[in-house]
């Protein structure tokens, strides 16, 4: 069965956009009229996960590419990378868990928590242009909040 | 607190259409699928459609495509079901309810729903 | 689609009676299930989410287990206002489905 998905933009709690940088990595910075045009569009696919109560497992695609954000261990730590997919074969319901992530919400506020590597979250600098991480701590500097806008089908 | 309010009771005659309506309050309608729900006397329920009015998707059960549209008006809170080419056994309450965008508490609030009644 | 089967269609039951309802589907869906009462003339309302989880304001007599393709309702001590018909949704695929109802009549 096609899993379900829907399209929309990401911006961390500072209102900063996040674009491509590069081909596989993805930076935040602050955008601003036609600039906005740059941001990256998600499809974000409702998936299998394991059943908590506040945490709705996600998976984050960039949409008509077949690109994923995914969280692999990199020189022994927990890293996000965008991998690229067979899109014959994704996105589907039981997606690999290093493609999952457990979207928390509380009032509007979104984070992103991997599910390969629990309480790691997907992370923005207070700094502009930087890329976006996978950040193993929540309410320090790093930024781990969002708010998501829906972005017509 | 959450509301769904649906417009009032019509009589039809077979072929033509009627549009339903389901005006939302207490929460922010963008976030929220409107589902479209039918019951016929004595029977169970039936999943018509859906749409995410902050996105504009819809998604309709194949059994009505084509005779069945769904829209929404963000102005004014208030999502419609237009069905045509009404035949008797159309004959049905239509409720609209609500449901989050990632589907997480399932159909939580209904409205109080509208019957239609397709009659010669 | 996504076939299913709510059984009974019909029980008569007593105050302070265990009564439990099933769903069962030709095939898996996640956590995707939802259960509602109907009195007649009213909207259905609900009662439970995601398999087990009890809708804010419901009576914790009311429970929701199972997965896979087997789902359960449980009314541990029946209450005379529970007396009503009970349906089960998923809402795991297109089209969701509803089970054919189950209705609780007073033995």
């Known amino acids: 069965a096609p899993v379900r998905s829907l399209n929309c933009t990401l911006r961390d709690s500072q209102q900063k956009s996040l674009v491509m940088s590069g081909p596989y990595e993805l930076k935040a910075l602050h955008l601003q009229g036609q600039d906005m045009e740059q941001q990256v569009v998600f499809s974000m696919s409702f998936v299998q996960g394991e059943e908590s109560n506040d945490k709705i497992p996600v998976a984050l695609g960039l949409k008509e590419k077949n690109l994923y954000l995914s969280c692999v261990l990199k020189d022994d730590k927990p890293t996000l990378q965008l991998e690229s997919v067979d899109p014959k074969n994704y996105p589907k319901k039981k997606m690999e868990k290093r493609f999952v992530f457990n979207k928390i919400e509380i009032n509007n506020k979104l984070e992103f928590e991997s599910a390969q590597f629990p309480n790691w979250y997907i992370s923005t600098s207070q700094a502009e242009n930087m890329p976006v991480f996978l950040g193993g701590t929540k309410g320090g500097q790093d930024i781990t909040d969002f708010t998501m806008q829906f972005v017509s089908s | 607190q959450v509301q769904l309010v649906q417009s009032g009771a019509e009589v039809k005659k077979p072929g033509s259409s009627v549009k339903v309506s389901c005006k939302a309050s207490g929460y922010t309608f963008d976030r929220y699928w409107i589902e479209w729900v039918r019951q016929a006397p004595g029977q169970g329920l039936e999943w018509m459609g859906e749409?995410?009015?902050?996105?504009?998707?819809?998604n309709y059960n194949e059994k009505f495509k084509g005779r069945v549209t769904i829209t929404a008006d963000k102005s004014t809170s208030t999502a419609y079901m237009e069905l045509s080419s009404l035949r008797s056994e159309d004959t049905a309450v239509y409720y609209c309810?609500?449901?989050?965008?990632?589907?997480?508490?399932?159909?939580?609030?209904w409205g109080q729903g509208t019957l239609v009644t397709v009659s010669s | 689609d996504i076939q299913m089967t709510q059984s009974p269609s019909s029980l008569s039951a007593s105050v302070g009676d265990r009564v439990t309802i099933t769903c069962k589907f030709s095939q898996d869906i996640d956590r995707f299930l939802s259960w509602f009462q109907q009195k007649p003339g009213k909207a259905p309302k609900s009662l439970i989410y995601?398999?087990?989880r009890l809708v804010d304001g419901v009576p914790s007599r009311f429970s929701g287990s199972g997965s896979g393709t087997d789902f359960t309702l449980t009314i541990s001590s029946l209450q005379p206002e529970d007396f009503a018909t009970y349906y089960c949704?998923?809402?795991?695929?297109?089209?969701?489905?509803f089970g054919g109802g189950t209705k609780v009549e007073i033995k």
């Open positions: 309810a609500r449901m989050y965008y990632d589907y997480d508490q399932g159909f939580d609030n």
């Open positions: 995601r398999v087990k």
């Open positions: 949704v998923q809402y795991d695929e297109f089209p969701y489905t």
């Open positions: 749409i995410l009015p902050g996105s504009g998707t819809i």
